[in-house]
Interface confidence: low
Amino acid sequence: MMTGTIETTGNISAEKGGSIILQCHLSSTTAQVTQVNWEQQDQLLAICNADLGWHISPSFKDRVAPGPGLGLTLQSLTVNDTGEYFCIYHTYPDGTYTGRIFLEVLESSVAEHGARFQIP
């Protein structure tokens, strides 16, 4: 039975050219996290594997940095980075938990962080 929940940074915005940290946190479960995948739409950004460590997709290695923790830092943001991001927690024995973050990259200097929210 999957009892865990994923808390994410929710809907966030950032300025073009800046950077942003994508964070997810898995709670309310004792399951072991074996791997975390970070994905944007239909592209894989990075993997953090419990045994093998981090691997950044070659397409993003210049603009994506691992961490902090199991999070992901996106740098040199462009308006094309606007969209959905997913953290996929592979756990044992629970299975797969998915969290969603929506990032809006703004041309202006007005960029506010949205509220945190939970995905059951």
């Epitope: 994905e39 239909d42 993997i47 093998l52 997913f86 998915t98």
Partner: nanobody, 128 residues
Framework: QVQLAESGGGSVQTGGSLRLSCAAS????????VAWFRQAPGKEREGVAR????????YYADSVKGRFIISQDNAKNTVYLQMNTLKPEDTAMYYC?????????????????????WGQGTQVTVSS
């Protein structure tokens, strides 16, 4: 455990077609993350195409887009790779692989290091 068996490889002329099959047995679920990889002599293994079985979501490497089609037959627990307009550079050993804990989407290539189950491979040779 999951067992994978590829078939359908062979020799073909440039511009020809082949259909590879990857039959899965064992503890398979409705949501499977299956990919085709290939490795040519002296080159690194590369991802060709992947399929998430429950959603039908597909992903292709740029080198095969528009020429290769990945599909499935759920009743037979089989994933296919239809390869059209083959080129000499498609010559390689082709492997199917399955990820143990499938992700929502995306193409996990990275030489296949994160895939848990592998078949023995089937050879494809394209001559000019």
């Amino acid at each position: 455990q999951v067992q994978l068996a590829e078939s359908g490889g062979g020799s073909v002329q440039t511009g020809g077609s082949l259909r590879l099959s990857c039959a899965a047995s064992g503890n398979t679920g409705s949501r499977r993350y299956v990919a085709w990889f290939r490795q040519a002599p002296g080159k690194e293994r590369e991802g060709v195409a992947r399929l998430i079985t429950d959603s039908g979501s597909t992903y292709y490497a740029d080198s095969v887009k528009g020429r290769f089609i990945i599909s499935q037959d759920n009743a037979k627990n089989t994933v296919y790779l239809q390869m059209n307009t083959l080129k000499p550079e498609d010559t390689a050993m082709y492997y199917c692989a399955e990820e143990l804990a499938p992700a929502r989407s995306g193409g996990i290539w990275f030489g296949g290091r994160y895939f848990s189950y592998w078949g023995q491979g089937t050879q494809v040779t394209v001559s000019s």
